[in-house]
């Protein structure tokens, strides 16, 4: 007996071939011997089966001795053994219809879990193997669970259902709601304008929610809310903003914040949260601000950085076109009685300059 696997909602063609390549009498029945369709003259006739309104055949192939039955909009309960009677012989085809669906909305927040449930006909024992867009393989039976979704899980999941050495493939689009980056650091010289951007890793037709940026300045004992905002159909409107600093926010996506001046007292870490309408949980992005200041006071040239820096970062003071350099894996460096000329303060990571500030030392007579 031939086995054919089908997908719920799909269309399947059950083939039945006669040895004579000519138009002949045929009919299809289910396992209860109820006629589904057949031929009368050149006309296709339908029987009393529940399937009849979804069953069809292609007349153009009858002349080739092919008497297929096509079933549209497959249902799990269409799983059955179908009998094609042609030229005094019977051909049996077992149809097994499967459905694979996500238990919840397919738009999920990063960190949430995804469960896929397999609908299958009674008596079947299928196995399921799913592959994420990032190449992660997950196997299961009637259910498949992905406990913690990551942003790279966004995209088309391909799931293969196997039964009796036959396979059928399902594609499920999953959207992981997250920011493009988990964390970002902005490096600025004192006094410069600071731009913070929070691009989303997904697009939705309608995007509505509310958000807030909490800030923990390095010099402060506690964190404070810098700004709160609403998002309505991708339009951003500010609800409340602190007086110091007076942040500005862009009206369109991606979420964009401007700090007029980078000052040492603002250096620190922020956490932007976004709560989306009809979703439980929040999207998070961490943002860091590192501020550099180079000063000369009497005989002392100092370069300092404030904000979250890793211990492996190097801070250097270097006299332009001269070999004189002082470097430290610290947050401040200084030179006593510096030579006259243009000095560079550099914050670097393994030779890559992250931030630089120039200061001119004038000769003292």
């Amino acid at each position: 007996k031939k086995v054919v696997l089908g997908k719920k909602g799909d269309t399947v063609e059950l083939t039945c071939n006669a040895s004579q390549k000519k138009n002949t009498q045929f009919h299809w029945k289910n396992s209860n011997q109820i006629k589904i369709l057949g031929i009368q003259g050149l006309f296709l006739t339908k029987g009393p089966s529940k399937l009849s309104d979804r069953a069809d055949s292609r007349k153009s192939l009858w002349d080739q001795g092919c008497f297929s039955m096509i079933i549209k909009n497959l249902k799990i309960e269409d799983s059955d053994t179908y009998i094609c009677e042609v030229e005094n012989k019977k051909e049996e085809v077992e149809l097994l219809v499967f459905g694979l669906t996500a238990n919840s909305d397919t738009h999920l927040l990063e960190g949430q879990s995804l469960t896929l449930t397999l609908e299958s006909p009674p008596g079947s024992s299928p196995s399921v193997k799913c592959r994420s867009p990032g190449g992660k393989n997950i196997q299961g039976g009637r259910t498949i669970s992905v406990p913690q979704l990551e942003r790279q899980d966004s995209g088309t999941w391909t799931c293969t259902v196997s039964q009796d050495q036959k396979t059928v493939e399902f594609k499920i689009d999953i959207v992981v709601l997250a920011f493009q980056k988990a964390s970002s650091t902005v490096y600025k010289k004192e006094g410069e304008q600071v731009e913070f951007s929070f691009p989303l890793a997904f697009t939705l037709e309608k995007l509505t929610g509310s958000g807030e940026l909490w800030w923990q300045a390095e010099r402060a004992s506690s964190s404070k809310s810098w700004i709160t905002f609403d998002l309505k159909n991708k339009e951003v409107s500010v609800k409340r903003v602190t007086q110091d600093p007076k942040l500005q926010m862009g009206k369109k996506l991606p979420l964009h914040l401007t700090l007029p001046q980078a000052l040492p007292q603002y250096a620190g870490s922020g956490n932007l949260t976004l709560a989306l309408e009809a979703k439980t949980g929040k999207l998070h992005q961490e943002v860091n601000l590192v501020v550099m200041r180079a000063t000369q006071f009497q005989e002392n040239l100092t370069c300092e950085v404030w904000g979250p820096t890793s211990p492996k970062l190097t801070l250097s003071l270097k006299l332009e076109n001269k070999g004189a350099t002082v470097s430290k894996q610290a947050k401040a460096v200084w030179v006593l009685n510096p030579e006259a000329g243009m000095w560079q303060c550099l914050l670097s990571d393994s030779g890559q300059v992250l931030l630089e500030s120039n200061i001119k030392v004038v000769p003292t007579w």
Epitope: G9, T11, E13, L42, F43
Partner: antibody, heavy 115, light 107 residues
């Protein structure tokens, strides 16, 4: 809701090969036959040929020697190649889904053959 | 090949008129016939299949009849959007063939 979107070169020189692809969005790819039909400017419709998801093809005997229809089920797309084109092959080419009748249809691509 | 012949090749009518288009097959095709409507610059659209079954979403002023070799498409009361070209198609055997078309114009 099934939608068909077709694409391919619109201007060819005589003796070149026409190449068109049709993307199928939504609905079932299996169980149906995926078809190419053409319509010369100001004229009627001519069936070129068809293919199913497993690669079985039927084509018009008047074009058979020049027609190749292929399918890529992983991308839900099917393609038409018509070799050695002449000015008589100038037409709007449509892709469509068939189960005895043609529905729905792609938007059509005007292919002009001119030296 | 089965030849499909439509008549008339063009017809002028007014809004509200009843219009009948006929299609004749060169051999018996039972009810393996469809009717399509095509507007300039657009793809054809299926109206009627299996000679007399109206496709979902198609207005009920369209109807089809006939079997064997002779078929008709009737529009009971013309609407402005019905002015277009109509084609019949046989699905009885390969190659599938179409009628030459009937252009329905405003009088």
């Amino acid at each position: 809701q099934v939608q068909l979107q077709q694409w391919g070169a619109g201007l060819l020189k005589p003796s070149e090969t026409l190449s068109l692809t049709c993307d199928v969005y939504g609905g079932s790819f299996s169980g149906y036959y995926w078809t190419w039909i053409r319509q010369p400017p100001g004229k009627g419709l001519e069936w070129i040929g068809e293919i199913n998801h497993s690669g079985t093809t039927n084509s018009n005997p008047s074009l058979k020697s020049r027609v190749t229809i292929s399918v890529d089920t992983s991308k839900s797309q099917f393609s038409l190649r018509l070799s050695s084109v002449t000015a008589a092959d100038t037409a709007v080419y449509f892709c469509t889904r068939e189960l005895n009748w043609f529905d729905p249809w792609g938007q059509g691509t005007l292919v002009t053959v001119s030296s | 090949d089965i030849q499909m012949t439509q008549s008339p090749s063009s017809v002028s009518a007014s809004v509200g008129d009843r219009v009948t288009i006929t299609c004749r097959a060169s051999q018996d095709i039972a009810n393996w016939l469809a009717w399509y409507q095509q507007k300039p610059g657009k793809a054809p659209q299926l109206l009627i299949y299996a000679a007399s079954s109206l496709l979902g979403g198609v207005p009920s002023r369209f109807s089809g009849s006939g079997s064997g070799a002779d078929f008709t498409l009737t529009i009971s009361s013309l609407h402005p959007e019905d002015f277009a070209t109509y084609y019949c198609q046989q699905a009885n055997s390969f190659p599938y063939t179409f009628g030459q078309g009937t252009k329905l114009e405003i009088k």
